[in-house]
């Protein structure tokens, strides 16, 4: 053996291999990556684990391993096996794990695997398998996991699977399967996980998943499906469903009616245009629903019975209104993204107490009422950019203590209510041409980034102080000071703010000191210092 020292390794450790005793005085033998072209011959009968992976073994002579009655795991991955004869694994009564991946098998061995009664895990992935003989798995009564991915199968080997009633997880991914026949998995009543991703599946039998009564995860991603997989309706225990990256154009009414346990559905990267309004009803475990660019949707989906939804994204559709009681259906919603729709009016969202992020940009909203966002105590981000908002109720944002990001850019605002926005760190108001007033920076002690319609409005946020320093370097003998600025532009402040001028100026100077770290754009810049901007604004 290869392990040195006085603690003699039991006889039967092949040369160059690494051997150690397991807790039961059985031998773990690692002969991986040694350039072996044949099996070592002097293996101990007491071997429980044998790793022969990453060698150059091209043949498994029948009965060479038959004495290894304690062998529980045999690794033959990454060799050059093209064929495994009948009898190759005879006598391996304890074998639980057999790894044959990354070889050159063109078919599953017809008889070699039969009656391995203890076998629980079988890896046949990454071979060139195009044929699975009907009885090749017979007698594998304990098999739980089967890997057949990354092969050359064109059909599901229906007959071969009939004997695998104990199977719990199987992958047929990365093959060339084009159709799934009715009852293809009809006897796999214990199967929990089924991976069929990265095939060429374009059609599914109406009953192709019938019999999969325990199935919880079904992966149909990256296929050629052009219709919704209605065959899922019998999968009453399904929790995770993926059919993203297909060619599905519509999701029918009551699409998931037979799958009340669904937690996750992945269906992005499909050219979905239409979704039945009842498609996502009665999914009490669903947490996330994301649908982008379904341009034929005109009505907000009915989500009765889908009350645990935490994230709802429905962008790029033609939804023009939300139900008044939308939050009665969605009390657990944390993220609501309805950007790029045709929403004009908003109901009160105050029932959605857990909302943290709302994105309503690129809609047709014209007014924010006082009740719309009332008492959303957890709301952190609100995006209302690119709408037609001309009116915002003075108290619209008054009960949003957690709000840190507010985007109202590219609207029609002429005034902006500041009540309740003292926690903001990000504020965007750019693109509101009618918004000419200065916004008192004292209302935003936490502000880090602000975007304003005009450069002069940045002066209230430390733009002047910063620019003053810069302009001092450019025009050192200018004699400009903050006092000069006050004198020059007193008229402006009187026009823009009705507070006592002196108070305002004191506040303004305090702000300049406190808020020097605020990034405000458009920046006045060195060639347009605040004093000039104020001046030119007065002329305007």
């Amino acid at each position: 053996g290869s392990s040195p020292g006085p603690d003699a390794i039991p006889r039967g450790c092949p040369s160059h291999c690494h051997c150690e005793l397991d807790g039961r005085m059985l031998l773990r033998v690692d002969c991986s990556d040694l350039g072996l072209s044949e099996l070592p011959s002097n293996l101990s009968v007491f071997t429980s684990y044998l790793d022969l992976s990453m060698n150059n073994i091209s043949q498994l002579p029948a009965s060479l391993l038959h004495r290894l009655c304690f062998l529980e795991e045999l690794r033959l991955a990454g060799n050059a096996l093209t064929h495994i004869p009948k009898g190759a694994f005879t006598g391996l009564h304890s074998l639980k794990v057999l790894m044959l991946q990354n070889n050159q098998l063109r078919q599953v061995p017809e008889e070699a695997l039969q009656n391995l009664r203890s076998l629980q895990s079988l890896r046949l992935d990454a071979n060139h398998i195009s044929y699975v003989p009907p009885s090749c798995f017979s007698g594998l009564h304990s098999l739980r996991h089967l890997w057949l991915d990354d092969n050359a199968l064109t059909d599901v080997p229906v007959q071969a699977f009939r004997s695998l009633s104990a199977l719990q997880a199987m992958t047929l991914a990365l093959n060339k399967i084009h159709h799934i026949a009715d009852y293809a998995f009809g006897n796999l009543s214990s199967l929990v996980v089924l991976h069929l991703h990265n095939n060429r599946i374009h059609s599914l039998g109406k009953k192709c998943f019938d019999g999969l009564h325990s199935l919880e995860t079904l992966d149909l991603n990256y296929n050629n499906l052009d219709e919704f997989p209605t065959a899922i309706k019998t999968l009453s225990n399904l929790k995770e469903l993926g059919f993203h990256s297909n060619n599905i154009r519509s999701i029918p009414e009551r699409a998931f009616v037979g799958n009340p346990s669904l937690i996750t559905i992945h269906f992005y990267d499909n050219p979905i245009q239409f979704v039945g309004v009842s498609a996502f009803q009665h999914l009490p475990e669903l947490r996330t629903l994301t649908l982008n660019g379904a341009s034929h949707i005109t009505e907000f989906p009915h989500l009765t019975g889908t009350a645990t939804l935490e994230s709802l994204t429905l962008t790029g559709a033609k939804i023009s209104s939300l139900p008044q009681a939308v939050c009665d259906q969605l009390p657990n919603l944390q993220v609501l993204d309805l950007s790029y729709n045709l929403l004009e009016d908003l109901p009160s969202l105050s029932g959605c107490q857990k909302l943290q992020k709302i994105d309503l940009r690129h809609n047709e909203i014209y007014e924010i009422k006082g009740s719309t966002f009332q008492q959303l105590f957890n709301l952190r981000s609100l995006n209302l950019a690119w709408n037609k908002i001309a009116i915002i109720h003075p108290n619209a944002f008054s009960t949003l203590p957690s709000l840190i990001k507010l985007d109202l850019s590219s609207n029609l605002l002429s005034s902006f209510p500041v009540t309740g926005l003292h926690g903001l760190t990000h504020l965007k108001l750019t693109g509101n041409r009618a918004l000419q007033s200065l916004i008192p920076s004292a209302n935003f002690p936490e502000l880090k980034i602000i975007e304003m319609p005009s450069a002069y409005q940045c002066c209230a946020f430390g733009g002047c102080e910063n620019v003053y320093k810069i302009s001092n370097q450019w025009n050192k003998d200018d004699g400009n000071s903050v006092d000069d600025l006050h004198k020059k532009d007193a008229g402006l402040f009187q026009v823009q703010d009705e507070r006592d001028l002196e108070d305002f100026l004191l506040d303004f100077e305090e702000d300049l000191k406190a808020l020097h770290s605020v990034q405000c754009s458009p920046s006045p810049g060195p060639f347009k210092p605040c004093e000039h901007l104020f001046g030119s604004w007065l002329i305007r």
Partner: antibody, heavy 118, light 111 residues
Amino acid sequence: EVQLVQSGAEVKKPGASVKVSCKASGYTFSAYWIEWVRQAPGQGLEWIGEILPGSDSTDYNEKFKVRATFTSDTSTSTVYLELSSLRSEDTAVYYCARGGHYGSLDYWGQGTLVTVSS
Amino acid sequence: DIVMTQSPDSLAVSLGERATINCRASESVDNYGNSFMHWYQQKPGQPPKLLIYLASNLESGVPDRFSGSGSGTDFTLTISSLQAEDVAVYYCQQNYEDPFTFGQGTKVEIK
């Protein structure tokens, strides 16, 4: 224990309609198809069609497509067969059965005798 | 429609003897290696009872004297040793394609 319990016998006049119910228990109702089969007196078995309870999925024998309607009520785990425009040759025992292993009919209701007579 | 034809129409067999019923489909009912052919037993006044599914698989709880064989279009139900309680009408059925169809039935009696 899987059970399918059907409604009682009916006597109908020609041209009328009949609605037969089939209440399922002992298994996940929406996970198995329910088949409808009829048997005229002294005759063989004739498949009418099938429904997957709770869904909109149905299949009808072309012969019955116009006159038969299958519905289901998941709240009571009940499936219904309605047959309209009854004729005397519709006199038969109507069975519901569960589509089990590979579509074989593994559990059957006790049958409902529908007699059509003027 | 696929037509199922059973033979014989009736069969009288001595107790303990073998009974064989044939069923022929007008076209193959095989799909991906599965034969979508099932056998049922019906006793008077009772609904049918599933015996064999997919041509040869014994339904749970059915005595092993019943067996099925065949593929494609020709199928056989065999009772290896007829018992008194086996007196009934036996039907074959295909569910390979809609409409699912039954054979006309074979009546098994004791000789």
